[in-house]
């Protein structure tokens, strides 16, 4: 659900951390309409997710930890 690199809505699916290689934060005050986490998957798809949802926060935390430990 994205247009010109902006997420316009959120996925209705839950993704597993093993499917995700990284993420980008989209901020509503930086040219896009909504806040979002854009997950980048192993299938080279970009998935727009709701940053308020617990499962999204969990994956962001996991990935952030991984980066810190590198």
């Amino acid at each position: 659900a994205s247009n010109f690199d902006c997420c316009l809505g959120y996925t209705d699916r839950i993704l597993h951390p093993k499917f995700i290689v990284g993420f980008t934060r989209q901020l509503a005050n930086e040219g896009c309409d909504i806040n979002a986490i854009i997950f980048h998957t192993k299938k080279k798809l970009s998935v727009c997710a709701n940053p308020k949802q617990t499962w999204v926060k969990y994956i962001v935390r996991l990935l952030s930890k991984k980066v810190k430990n590198m």
Epitope: I14, L15, H16, K42, T54, W55
Partner: antibody
């Protein structure tokens, strides 16, 4: 110890709705998902959906096309599963089960099951 | 939706046998796979999570392996209490889907 206690067996007529409860104890209720899985006679396991008690987020199997609704009462650590427009194929044992991020999204504790019979 | 296919659908074996159950996914699920055991009249029990990790309290005769689309549950030496139905489950992406089950019976 972790316990999930479900409500008792139900007999319903086709077209009716059923609401099954699942009361959790022995762990921090808002830290884990609650899934619902069913097993019809002679069939395999089927995932119906989940609810996150911390933010009431729900995710449903579209196979049920809006017939299933999951709700939560955090004050009593209880999750409810309502299935509407019942048909004979909905006759099954319904389970609530805890979803755990820590075991790779596995379902690590299960309720005892609730038999729902749909019959005219 | 991701489809999960188990084989065989039923299996006869004896106490002490080594048994292997396979599970295939319709696409790569990157190890996001769990195994459950179900006995008649009882709730399912988590055996293996993340394709290879043994759940708490599960005997070490159970093991899981695999990657990509193909996964295996192995019981190294069957015990009388192991006769049950086994299910694999995809947790890569919702809807979470189960295999149709493998019923393990006494020969």
């Amino acid at each position: 110890q972790v316990q999930l206690v479900q409500s008792g067996a139900e007999v319903k007529k086709p077209g009716a709705s059923v609401k099954v409860s699942c009361k959790a104890s022995g762990y921090t209720f808002t830290s884990y998902w609650m899934h619902w899985v069913r097993q019809a006679p002679g069939q395999g396991l089927e995932w119906m959906g989940l609810i996150d008690p911390s933010d009431k987020y729900t995710n449903y199997n579209q196979k049920f096309k809006g017939r299933v609704t999951l709700t939560v009462d955090t004050s009593t650590s209880t999750v409810y599963m309502e299935l509407s427009s019942l048909r004979s194929e909905d006759t099954a044992v319904y389970y609530c089960t805890r979803g755990n991020y820590g075991v790779d999204y596995g379902m690590d504790y299960w309720g005892q099951g609730t038999l729902v019979t749909v019959s005219s | 939706d991701i489809q999960m296919t188990q084989s065989p659908s039923s299996l006869s074996a004896s106490v002490g046998d080594r048994v292997t159950i396979t599970c295939g996914a319709s696409e790569n699920i990157y190890g996001a796979l769990n195994w459950y055991q179900r006995k008649p009249g009882k709730a399912p029990k988590l055996l293996i999570y993340g394709a290879t990790n043994l759940a708490d309290g599960v005997p070490s005769r159970f093991s899981g392996s695999g990657s990509g689309r193909d996964y295996t549950l192995t019981i190294s030496s069957l015990q009388p209490e192991d006769f049950a139905t086994y299910y694999c489950q995809n947790v890569l992406i919702t809807p979470y889907t189960f295999g149709q089950g493998t019923k393990l019976e006494i020969k």
